[in-house]
């Protein structure tokens, strides 16, 4: 087959006329959209056949595929065919119209598909979007075919800009039929039971009408069969449920319970398993470590958390200094115990805007008729340090003293430092640390007292300066685990008149 012009892609002007010729050794025909448009067929003296397709007054709607094929006179078609793609850029045509079936794309598996939005002009930039979103999707575009890729079960539109107007395509809908033809779920009323209690399991199949259930369970292996009950859940169409009920469980009933479901229409099957534990008696077990000393910062909120496992559900109580705690109406204390899984619990004590009086001995107790556990810790309230007083005095002995007093919890550390060059220190030069035993020019005396009522330490430190010959900036810094505070005082020599 010989096609002129050969293509394989042509860009033609709107309103123009164009002639396509195809020739071959047998009768040939032009096809457009599975139909044969009017064309002139001829047979030359040398025995070659030709067909001439004249496209007149071209519009954007003439954009698309054109095929030339052998059209055997005996009605047989050979495989050989030539494809030509013609673009007719036409600003009056946005996206080429689609057949209804092209707008709906149906899939049963994850496979590459094409969203066939096509334009008349190969120079146009086309983007793909989810119908509900503005962000362009990173999918490759072929101007002759559309966007090809693996698409989610959504609706999509294509966008392009022609001149200064934005044009949207029709919406394309991707429908994916989930053919995991059987969807089985197994659950138990409880996965942990005490001996003598009942085991009840449910196996549910969604979306199938004709299914067969088969249960495997520890008791079956010893030949003790249990007859399951199958029912339809009326409020949920085509949810079929098989219930396996074992009354008065024994320790030997612990193990794996499997529900196997088969359906005959497509010969599919699926199975799900669940583990059941039968315990001799109930239990309560702490999980993780909680230190015997806990800290909270004054006026901040603090949550103390205990994680434990229990069956059956326990009662949980909190105590402070052996007095039972409850949620306070003022909202200063909040207690909560929540079930985070079937047998796992988290109990929390929240102290809101902690006060000094809330320091003390706390205990959490979890118990039921079979077992109990308790956990205790001391709560220390940390108070940021503050310098309460920094004063300078001049005893008759001639030395000068600076006294610094502060409080905090835990016990504050004290650091004395001085700046001798007031112009450059501390911005350019670091302050000098004072009170080191090697320095004879200053002596340090520090006393620490614990105030039981306020539950904090008081530090009083006195710095003795032997001879001060020029103004000196003395700084007292108190530090503890939750903060630091600083004050400074200018110490001047005895001799200076403005002292």
């Amino acid at each position: 087959l010989v096609v002129t012009p050969p293509g394989p892609e042509l860009v033609l002007n709107v309103s123009s006329t164009f002639v396509l010729t195809c020739s071959g050794s047998a009768p040939v025909v032009w096809e457009r959209m599975s139909q044969e448009p009017p064309q002139e067929m001829a047979k030359a003296q040398d025995g070659t056949f030709s067909s001439v397709l004249t496209l007149t007054n071209l519009t954007g709607l003439d954009t698309g595929e054109y095929f030339c094929t052998h059209n055997d006179s005996r009605g047989l078609e050979t495989d050989e065919r030539k494809r030509l793609y013609i673009f007719v850029p036409d600003p009056t045509v946005g996206f080429l119209p689609n057949d209804a079936e092209e707008l709906f794309i149906f899939l049963t598996e994850i496979t590459e598909i094409t969203i066939p939005c096509r334009v008349t002009d190969p120079q146009l930039v086309v983007t793909l979007h989810e119908k509900k979103g503005d962000v362009a999707l990173p999918v490759p575009y072929d101007h002759q075919r559309g966007f090809s890729g693996i698409f989610e079960d959504r609706s999509y539109i294509c966008k392009t800009t022609i001149g200064d107007r934005e044009v949207d395509s029709d919406a394309y809908y991707v429908y994916r039929l989930q053919v995991s033809s059987i969807n089985v779920s197994v659950n138990a009323v409880q996965t942990v039971v005490r001996q003598g209690e009942n085991i009840t399991l449910m196996c549910i199949v969604i979306g199938n009408e004709v299914v067969n259930f088969e249960w495997t369970y520890p008791r079956k292996e010893s030949g003790r069969l249990v007859e399951p009950v199958t029912d339809f859940l009326l409020d949920m169409p085509y949810h079929i449920r098989s219930i396996l009920h074992i009354p008065s469980a024994e320790l030997e009933d612990s193990g794996t319970y499997t529900c196997n479901v088969t359906e005959s229409v497509n010969d599919h099957q699926d199975e799900k398993a669940i583990n059941i534990t039968v315990v001799e008696s109930g239990y309560v077990r702490l999980l993780g470590e909680v230190g015997t000393l806990q800290f909270a910062e004054l006026h901040r909120s603090r949550t103390l958390q205990v994680v434990f496992e229990a069956y059956p559900p326990p009662t949980v109580l909190w105590f402070k200094d052996n007095r039972t705690l409850g949620d306070s109406s003022a909202g200063e204390i909040a207690l909560s115990t929540r079930n985070v899984s079937e047998t796992r619990y988290v109990s929390e004590l929240t102290l809101v805007r902690v006060k000094v009086a809330e320091a003390g001995h706390y205990t959490m107790r979890a118990f039921h008729e079979d077992a109990e556990v308790q956990l205790s810790f001391q709560l220390q309230i940390n108070v940021p340090v503050r310098v309460l007083e920094l004063s300078e005095s001049h005893p008759d002995s001639g030395e000068q003293t600076v006294r610094c007093r502060g409080r905090g919890m835990p016990q504050p550390n004290i650091i004395w430092s001085a700046c001798r060059d007031l112009k450059r220190c501390p911005r350019e030069l670091p302050p000098t640390l004072l009170g080191n035993s090697s320095e004879e020019e200053s002596q340090l005396e520090t006393n620490v007292t614990y105030w039981e009522e306020e539950q904090e330490f008081e530090v009083v430190s006195t710095l003795r300066l032997q001879h001060v010959d020029r103004p000196l900036s003395v700084r007292c810094t108190l530090r503890n685990a939750v903060g630091q505070d600083t004050q400074e005082v200018i110490v001047v020599p005895h001799s200076l008149p403005f002292k």
């Epitope: 149906f106 119908k131 509900k132 989610e152 079960d153 959504r154 609706s155 809908y173 429908y175």
Partner: nanobody, 116 residues
Framework: QMQLVQSGAEVKNPGASVKVSCKAS????????IQWVRQAPGQGLEWMGW????????HSAQKFQGRVTMTRDTSISTAYMELSGLTSDDTAVYYC?????????WGQGTLVTVSS
Amino acid sequence: QMQLVQSGAEVKNPGASVKVSCKASGYPFSAYYIQWVRQAPGQGLEWMGWLNPNSGDTHSAQKFQGRVTMTRDTSISTAYMELSGLTSDDTAVYYCATHGGDRSYWGQGTLVTVSS
């Protein structure tokens, strides 16, 4: 939750007709087109046509034109698909489906068996 529930399995003789129902719930029935699709044993999905539940307009694939009739009863939010002139090639699972924009929703399928 959008949900489509179809009528039960059918066994038909060649030449007979079958009518499959599809009841919608969990959304305004008239808001979204209902598509009818079938899957013959071992084959892919084949689109049959759509129904606009709002207007009652339908459009069927060329292959089924003249044989398929799609109707609806808005008072009970149910769409119907009737296929006439059944042959053994029409043995398939027939599905109704709709698209909420963010995902598609399917009926559970109705098995239609054509045999003499």
